[in-house]
Interface confidence: low
């Protein structure tokens, strides 16, 4: 039943491109060369991309031709290295053409960067897009995947995929309609935070398979299977499991191509076998391949059985416990895994990893015990305070959030963080904290039975944000020490963090709080972050400020912009009054 | 890989007896309660009887209680299912899986009970 043994093909970019169809196969290999070469310029791309078109074609022509037989990363990597700036644009990148496969690909993928320097997406006026639109919808939709490839390097390309087709259908309908931008512009708006939370989702998987392996991958996965299809059996689970690995295996490593053909192939599996796996799955399959598999990753967790058994009996009371755990280890605890998370859809992933990580470490030590069933019979009552953590940790923070909305609930993460991580750039900070802080809005109105699933796994992805970008410039120990200790323990890692007592505050730098009547005319979002910026540095010059401190001294900030803003002389106001402010807040803060 | 082979199934007359067995591998048998679950043609998979992984507790749907007995072989790493004083509607195709799941992950085994 493995849906991925296939026969040997005599040429793989024939046998891909026949299976994808031209289109697709043109869209991924555009998304694998801008995530690659993420400076390169669109038409640069759209040529190699042409090319390699051009040469599968002869291939599908006869497989017997030359160099069709050779490997995908052969023919990518090869086309990569033709590019004439690779030295000067990349610099120690071009080293890699220096290499054989695999090492040239994976010198590829280790050059991959996860804060490209370049300019942030300004959005055109929506009849410029419009006619930009109509005028070459082919160049315009092959720009959005570029566009958002390269500024999103490990981001799912079949899910990119079908992110650009939903682009096309907002311009496509948008564009006729009688207010053009009050039909596109939410749906846009819509497209990048989803965007966003997808190019997040994945960059988790990839960094859980390429820091932590193909075990600690494959034990999320059977948690996360297990919640959403109860019902399944855990051969069926494990299948599911199996394929989904080489599927993220196959995108995180550049193998765009295998990748999405087969998501396709999964996809098409779990619907044919939606009676063994779940009752929640009839409208995903009837819909087209790219909706149907968004579909199914997002699909809602199917009801539990009715009267499953204790756990107790097969985990803890057998006298076999050790005997079967020996057998077969990891066999055991997937099993363990699978029947704990398909009892608790109300437990995050993580927190059922560490239950079975506790599980584990327990039955190495007492299968080791004179008397192992003594040792481990208690081993459930370990679980309570791991359970009761992220359960008390996210009701005091969602009482925070309902206390002080959003925006001041950023604030005292922001707050919070740079106390803990003071080194971390400032910008790092702000991204990192105000998604953090968006954890309330998304998981606070849920029940009690959801919010730990959607607070804890949803801070595990924006934490993860935040380990890529200090992976690039390491700057602080902990933050280190956090990131790469255990993966399911990032999360209690940073929360268990104090106040940094052995951080030298920043010199005082008027500079970085001398504001501009340009405030004025950014959106809300842009001026929260501004404010959001100013907190950090304030925070950075003085750690030990307290909240009311720094409560006052941003009141006195918010009310200078907005009596500023409303000034006739914008500018010579922000001059003046920002001198007093600065003065003010030194005082305040005791700089 | 987790393989469990069903075996046993037939044709058989109303009122007459079937044993079923359930060849597991790919697993530690003995750490597990196992099920049997049939799927009747035109209907969904119905949940027959369940056993722990000791073989000390039984469960029965109310359907078959009195009729049907659960039991396993950990030695030899199979699942039993001793059925009696078969009815028509017993016709099933019948599956035996992990824990108590009502989905199939096996080929199952086909019982016929004509009246």
């Known amino acids: 039943r493995g849906v991925f043994r296939r026969d040997a093909h005599k040429s793989e970019v024939a046998h891909r491109f026949k299976d994808l169809g031209e289109e697709n196969f043109k869209a991924l290999v555009l998304i694998a060369f801008a995530q690659y070469l993420q400076q390169c310029p669109f038409e640069d791309h759209v040529k190699l991309v042409n090319e390699v078109t051009e040469f599968a074609k002869t291939c599908v022509a006869d497989e017997s031709a030359e160099n069709c037989d050779k490997s995908l990363h052969t023919l990518f990597g090869d086309k990569l290295c033709t590019v004439a700036t690779l030295r000067e644009t990349y610099g120690e990148m071009a080293d890699c053409c220096a290499k054989q496969e695999p090492e040239r690909n994976e010198c590829f993928l280790q050059h991959k960067d996860d804060n490209p320097n370049l300019p942030r997406l300004v959005r055109p006026e929506v009849d410029v897009m419009c006619t930009a639109f109509h005028d070459n919808e082919e160049t315009f939709l092959k720009k959005y995947l570029y566009e958002i490839a390269r500024r999103h390097p490990y981001f799912y390309a079949p899910e990119l995929l079908f992110f650009a087709k939903r682009y096309k259908a907002a311009f496509t309908e948008c564009c006729q309609a009688a207010d053009k931008a009050a039909c596109l512009l939410p749906k846009l708006d819509e497209l990048r935070d989803e965007g966003k939370a997808s190019s997040a989702k994945q960059r988790l998987k990839c960094a859980s398979l390429q820091k932590f392996g193909e075990r600690a991958f494959k034990a999320w996965a059977v948690a996360r299977l297990s919640q959403r299809f109860p019902k399944a059996e855990f051969a069926e689970v494990s299948k599911l499991v199996t394929d989904l690995t080489k599927v993220h295996t196959e995108c995180c490593h550049g193998d765009l191509l295998e990748c999405a053909d087969d998501r396709a192939d999964l996809a098409k599996y779990i619907c044919e076998n939606q009676d063994s796996i779940s009752s929640k799955l009839k409208e995903c399959c009837e819909k087209p391949l790219l909706e149907k598999s968004h579909c199914i990753a997002e699909v809602e967790n199917d009801e539990m059985p009715a009267d499953l058994p204790s756990l107790a009996a097969d985990f803890v009371e057998s006298k076999d416990v050790c005997k079967n755990y020996a057998e077969a280890k990891d066999v055991f605890l997937g099993m363990f895994l699978y029947e704990y998370a398909r009892r608790h859809p109300d437990y995050s992933v993580v927190l059922l990893l560490r239950l079975a990580k506790t599980y584990e470490t327990t039955l190495e030590k007492c299968c080791a015990a004179a008397d192992p069933h003594e040792c481990y019979a208690k081993v459930f009552d370990e679980f309570k305070p791991l359970v009761e953590e992220p359960q008390n940790l996210i009701k005091q923070n969602c009482e925070l959030f309902e206390q002080l909305g959003e925006y001041k609930f950023q604030n005292a993460l922001l707050v919070r963080y740079t106390k803990k991580v003071p080194q971390v750039s400032t910008p790092t900070l702000v991204e990192v904290s105000r998604n953090l802080g968006k954890v309330g809005s998304k998981c606070c109105k849920h029940p009690e039975a959801k919010r730990m699933p959607c607070a804890e796994d949803y801070l595990s992805v924006v934490l993860n944000q935040l380990c890529v970008l200090h992976e690039k410039t390491p700057v602080s120990d902990r933050v280190t020490k956090c990131c790469t200790e255990s993966l399911v323990n990032r999360r209690p890692c940073f929360s268990a963090l104090e106040v940094d007592e052995t951080y030298v505050p920043k010199e005082f730098n008027a500079e970085t709080f001398t504001f501009h009547a340009d405030i004025c005319t950014l959106s809300e979002k842009e001026r929260q972050i501004k404010k959001q910026t100013a907190l950090v540095e304030l925070v950075k010059h003085k750690p030990k400020a307290t909240k009311e401190q720094l409560k006052a001294v941003m009141d006195d900030f918010a009310a200078f912009v907005e009596k500023c803003c409303k000034a006739d002389d914008k500018e010579t106001c922000f001059a003046e009054e920002g001198k007093k402010l600065v003065a003010a807040s030194q005082a305040a803060l005791g700089l | 890989e987790v393989q469990l082979v069903e075996s046993g199934g037939g044709l058989v007359q109303s009122g007459g007896s079937l044993r079923l067995s359930c060849a597991a591998s790919?697993?530690?048998?003995?750490?597990?309660?196992m099920s049997w679950v049939r799927q009747a043609p035109g209907k969904g998979p119905e949940w027959v009887s369940a056993i722990d992984g000791g073989g000390a507790d039984t469960r029965y749907a109310e359907s078959v209680k009195g009729r049907f007995t659960i039991s396993r072989d950990n030695a030899k790493k199979t699942l039993y299912l001793q059925m009696n004083s078969l009815k028509p509607e017993d016709t099933a195709v019948y599956y035996c899986?992990?824990?108590?799941?009502?989905?199939?992950g096996s080929q199952g085994t086909q019982v016929t009970v004509s009246s």
């Open positions: 790919g697993f530690t048998f003995g750490s597990f309660g």
């Open positions: 899986t992990i824990g108590q799941s009502t989905s199939r």
